[in-house]
């Protein structure tokens, strides 16, 4: 439905508040280093322009595309060259190349200071003094640090952020009310960002077909009572929404997401029995709720898959007529029967089925050739099952911190060239799979664990892509989206790695460690552990554990000392000397 003025269309659809918020998010995700005030100024200018277009869609420049309007606005930033370097070259390009250029310069790990949470009273004062600016600042700070954050979902987070301050700033104990809510929003926000990053990577690196396959599998698990045609329609619409958001088209994305939520709620009866509560909520909550809704119950008496996909004499005929539709049906039928499988496993099974049909439909006796295709699935199913069983046992034995340490050692030995901060961040997140998924019954463990690991390994892939240092990481990240986890699992110790030269500075600690939170202290220790493995990749698990215990004893001793700094200096030297002697550093 063509509109004379796209900007007027979106302004009217979304309303002024959401329009301004989404433009701010878009700009902050593109120009991640720009000060808040500069972005607010740009957003206000765009908003005023949009209002003129709403008043008269034929007004000058109102017919321009959103990319043209937004790109022109971004290119007016005076400090573009000195702040962003070669990104300024994007401004010499025409649309659509200019937008593609901006997208390529999005930085997954921008050099921005860590967000430090002020005192509760300070935050409440700021909230009361200027609520609008306070909330805009939240959107800006999250968007610039997470340039692929799902924009309509960020509006939902901002709504909850506002609600937390509205409630807690008038509570008797403000901190007790507010801090747990902010912690929850922070943790959920990081998880949401990482999940969306995988969707964008899937679309951008592996194409629309890969994303659609993922969506067919996931939606079929979630809505097993829906017909294939219904699932296909939802997949098409969902793909459009995510393509837009990942492409920086945030106004279209938010608008289309609202339309999709509306459609789902109007057609609940043919989609899922679990949507009733979601559909009674306001728009942002509704969309979030639908995205997180539990799987519907499987229809009773689903026939065996073998009839249509193995035993039928028409398998090759049906496949040849419309390959992707037939494979889509296979994926739909398999996924709706298997909420206990991870999406990536279902996609591996579909790929195996496709490969078999490609080979067998060209054979002399196709049926004879593909008759045993389902037998090929068994090892593919058992591999993640066994891995999850082993790792959950290890997690239950060690607890989260020590399980993370085991993974740190494992992954540092696999890919020691990767930067220490990345190894620590990724291994810590991999280790969280234990507390997140191992508590679940068998039927929910695999979808929880393996699909979560896909999200975490994508973090490794996008961080590594910025500064590639390991061919093994590049290979696992680029060869196959669904086989990333098995690829990393299969990596053994990198025997070609030349141990890092010993640097005493890496193992020098100061009294500031004593005042850190438990989490920050763990990160310090885990950083030391990674460095230790990089210096001594041949060290045994037992030796590493023992050296880390010495480190813990050293920190504990010095944090109790009267002159902490002297203790850290003197005892630190002894610790390094002792470890060098013991491990031959």
């Amino acid at each position: 439905d063509a509109h004379k003025s796209e900007v007027a269309h979106r302004f009217k659809d979304l309303g002024e508040e959401n329009f301004k918020a989404l433009v701010l998010i878009a700009f902050a995700q593109y120009l991640q280093q720009c000060p808040f005030e500069d972005h607010v100024k740009l957003v206000n200018e765009v908003t005023e322009f949009a209002k003129t277009c709403v008043a008269d869609e034929s007004a000058e420049n109102c017919d321009k595309s959103l990319h043209t309007l937004f790109g022109d606005k971004l290119c007016t930033v005076a400090t573009l060259r000195e702040t962003y370097g070669e990104m300024a070259d994007c401004c010499a390009k025409q649309e659509p190349e200019r937008n593609e250029c901006f997208l390529q310069h999005k930085d997954d790990n921008p050099n921005l200071p860590r967000l430090v949470r002020p005192e509760v009273d300070v935050m409440c004062t700021a909230f009361h003094d200027n609520e609008e600016t306070f909330l805009k600042k939240y959107l800006y700070e999250i968007a610039r640090r997470h340039p692929y954050f799902y924009a309509p979902e960020l509006l939902f987070f901002a709504k909850r952020y506002k609600a937390a301050f509205t409630e807690c700033c008038q509570a008797a104990d403000k901190a007790a009310c507010l801090l747990p809510k902010l912690d929850e929003l922070r943790d959920e926000g990081k998880a949401s960002s990482a999940k969306q990053r995988l969707k964008c990577a899937s679309l951008q690196k592996f194409g629309e077909r890969a994303f659609k396959a993922w969506a067919v599998a996931r939606l079929s698990q979630r809505f097993p009572k829906a017909e294939f045609a219904e699932v296909s329609k939802l997949v098409t619409d969902l793909t459009k929404v995510h393509t837009e958001c990942c492409h920086g088209d945030l106004l279209e994305c938010a608008d289309d997401r609202a339309d999709l939520a509306k459609y789902i709620c109007e057609n609940q009866d043919s989609i899922s029995s679990k949507l009733k509560e979601c559909c009674e909520k306001p728009l942002l909550e509704k969309s979030h709720c639908i995205a997180e809704v539990e799987n519907d119950e499987m229809p009773a008496d689903l026939p065996s898959l073998a009839a249509d996909f193995v035993e039928s004499k028409d398998v090759c005929k049906n496949y040849a007529e419309a390959k992707d539709v037939f494979l889509g049906m296979f994926l739909y039928e398999y996924a709706r029967r298997h909420p206990d499988y991870s999406v990536v496993l279902l996609l591996r099974l579909a790929k195996t089925y496709e490969t078999t049909l490609e080979k067998c439909c060209a054979a002399a006796d196709p049926h004879e050739c593909y008759a045993k295709v389902f037998d090929e699935f068994k090892p593919l199913v058992e591999e993640p099952q066994n891995l999850i069983k082993q790792n959950c046992e290890l997690f239950e034995q060690l607890g989260e911190y020590k399980f993370q340490n085991a993974l740190l050692v494992r992954y540092t030995k696999k890919v020691p060239q990767v930067s220490t901060p990345t190894l620590v961040e990724v291994s810590r997140n991999l280790g969280k799979v234990g507390s997140k998924c191992c508590k679940h019954p068998e039927a929910k463990r695999m979808p929880c664990a393996e699909d979560y690991l896909s999200v975490v390994l994508n973090q490794l892939c996008v961080l590594h892509e910025k500064t590639p240092v390991s061919d093994r990481v590049t290979k696992c990240c680029t060869e196959s989206l669904v086989n990333r986890r098995p690829c990393f699992s299969a990596l053994e110790v990198d025997e070609t790695y030349v141990p890092k030269e010993f640097n005493a500075e890496t193992f020098t600690f100061h009294a500031d460690i004593c005042t850190l939170s438990e989490k920050e202290r763990q990160i310090k220790k885990q950083t030391a552990l990674v460095e230790l493995v990089k210096h001594k990749p041949k060290a045994t698990k037992e030796q590493l554990k023992a050296v880390m215990d010495d480190f813990a004893a050293f920190v504990e001793k010095c944090c109790k000392a009267d002159d902490k700094e002297t203790c850290f200096a003197e005892e630190g030297k002894k610790l390094v000397a002792a470890s060098q002697a013991a491990l031959g550093l």
């Epitope: 020590k402 037992e542 030796q543 023992a546 010495d550 004893a553 002697a581 013991a582």
Partner: nanobody, 124 residues
């Protein structure tokens, strides 16, 4: 199961020396730090010394620093506590303990396996 057996305690005069030994059997001795603790009559169990897995790093309680020396011989699965310039206030039952997998290095709760103890009495 780990077994720890202390020996070498006895009755000595103030200013004398004693050497305690602790022989271990069971799980790999060289993988774990060892600790020495003591308990005087009517008092809490008190940290004395910790020696790391390789014998290259030792920590002592302030009350014994400069007088006591911990060492270990991993080939013999034995840890030692050389006690010089003994004082009457060193009188206690001395225990050796093998480090556990968590908890404080200076607290009994951080140690998993314990010997039965050996009595040290220092008369004035």
């Amino acid at each position: 199961q780990v077994q720890l057996v202390e020996s070498g305690g006895g009755l000595v005069q103030a200013g004398d020396s004693l050497r305690l030994s602790c022989a271990a059997s069971g799980r790999t001795f060289s993988d774990y730090a060892m600790g020495w603790f003591r308990q005087a009559p009517g008092k809490e169990l008190e940290f004395v010394a910790r020696i790391n897995w390789s014998g290259t790093l030792t920590y002592y309680a302030d009350s014994v620093k400069g007088r006591f020396t911990a060492s270990r011989d991993n080939a013999k699965n034995t840890v030692y506590l050389q006690m010089n310039s003994l004082k009457p206030e060193d009188t206690a039952v001395y225990y050796c303990a093998q480090r556990g997998d968590s908890g404080s290095n200076y607290d009994p709760s951080g140690y998993r396996y314990w010997g039965q103890g050996t009595q040290v009495t220092v008369s004035s």
